[in-house]
Amino acid sequence: FSGSEATAAILSRAPWSLQSVNPGLKTNSSKEPKFTKCRSPERETFSCHWTDEVHHGTKNLGPIQLFYTRRNTQEWTQEWKECPDYVSAGENSCYFNSSFTSIWIPYCIKLTSNGGTVDEKCFSVDEIVQPDPPIALNWTLLNVSLTGIHADIQVRWEAPRNADIQKGWMVLEYELQYKEVNETKWKMMDPILTTSVPVYSLKVDKEYEVRVRSKQRNSGNYGEFSEVLYVTLPQMSQFTCEEDFY
């Protein structure tokens, strides 16, 4: 997480006050467990993760527990409830299924050990949306230049399976990146709202890597990249007549 630290004052200052956090990683400079990330892949569930490296070698720290509260109405619910599921999202995590998740209210979470709070954060679900990677990447040839040196391709993909695109619950924007296989720096294309995009002027004698990632439009952060799609453009002699491509 980055941004200002949330403390118990969050809940006492005003019943609906909320300090927002960025879901990005935060370096754990202290010796106590810290939240590292909260993420919702599809606005219907979310999970939070924390560090626990030092904890293994520290005798005076008790078991780490996560508690949460959400502002359901008029005031923050005064009771903190314990994490509903420590298992489904892996080690040092808490998973909130769809019954516990709504984008329409703010949440606060805290990590405790021996009854004391060691870290605390507040957020709304939309701020922590990071979609799963796009899937089923493929490409087709659009055309080849008259010189036979360059070619244009169309790259297509599908939204992650758990993203409810049809009902408009998620509106994803996509970022495509590509590079020659032996290069280190990726070329970035402008974000788009469609699931296909042309890539122009690729060299026909080179092999390219293409990857795509997505984010919820107007909120959240980019998710992980898709698996890399390899694009090999054969030499000009392997193509049929140039005229066929125009």
């Epitope: 200052r13 005003a14 019943p15 609906w16 006050s17 909320l18 300090q19 927002s20 219907e44 959400r70 502002r71 359901n72 109405t73 008029q74 769809s98 019954s99 516990f100 709504s102 329409w104 209210i105 703010p106 507040c122 709304s124 939309d126 701020e127 009902k167 619950w169 107007n218 909120s219």
Partner: antibody, heavy 115, light 108 residues
């Protein structure tokens, strides 16, 4: 005590514009998530729009029926919520309520769209 | 969106009687995110119950709520004269927040 007082309603022709205001007091306005909810004459309640706090980047949300025509905004220094309504239609005729988290409600202001 | 259907549309009862109001959702709503409101003529809605069964501040305990999934109920154990009003259910779980069409509780 939470108080929400709406103003700015009135009679407007179809295609016209109107800006509603909601003066808030009795709570920390800058921390609050605020909504507009409307009620057509003799009908039920319809959620219109929401704006979140500065801590939440003043994120805004709209009902499909008003998206692209209405804009919710706020001035935290004045403890005031706004609803800018453009391209008004006859079906926008309603009492517009300003609400805090849809828990506390103002008394509403009537908007009539008619030629 | 999740559509909330309230029944009956109108409930005609006498003071002292028990009122049972129903709210049915087109898809499952977590009990944490369902509220009930009361509205009297010429007044703004007032929050009665939040999270299906919790009484809002200042609401008398003759009001109670229950339910889960797609079926929710508001019960008024003994109707007082001031309880005759329109009642709305409201969900803020998935999609955009929606309200039911309302149930009018009138004096018989």
């Amino acid at each position: 005590e939470v108080q929400l007082v709406e103003s700015g309603g009135g009679l407007v022709k179809p295609g016209g514009s109107l800006r509603l205001s909601c003066a808030a007091s009795g709570f920390t306005f800058s921390d609050a998530w605020m909504d507009w909810v409307r009620q057509a004459p003799g009908k039920g309640l319809e959620w219109v729009a929401e704006i979140r706090s500065k801590a939440n980047n003043h994120a805004t949300y709209y009902a499909e029926s008003v998206k692209g025509r209405f804009t919710i905004s706020r001035d935290d220094s004045k403890n005031t919520l706004y609803l800018q309504m453009n391209s008004l239609k006859t079906e926008d005729t309603a009492v517009y309520y300003c609400t805090l988290f849809r828990d506390y409600w103002g008394q509403g202001t009537l908007v009539t769209v008619s030629s | 969106e999740i559509v909330l259907t309230q029944s009956p549309g109108t409930l005609s009862l006498s003071p002292g009687e028990r009122a049972t109001l129903s709210c049915t959702a087109t898809s499952s709503v977590s009990s944490s995110y369902l509220n009930w409101y009361q509205q009297k003529p010429g007044q703004a809605p007032r929050l009665l119950i939040y999270s299906t069964s919790n009484l809002a501040s200042g609401i008398p305990d003759r009001f109670s709520g229950s339910g889960s999934g797609t079926d929710f109920t508001l019960t008024i154990s003994r109707l007082e004269p001031e309880d005759f009003a329109v009642y709305y259910c409201h969900q803020y779980h998935r999609f955009t927040p929606t309200f039911g069409g309302g149930t009018k509780v009138e004096i018989k």
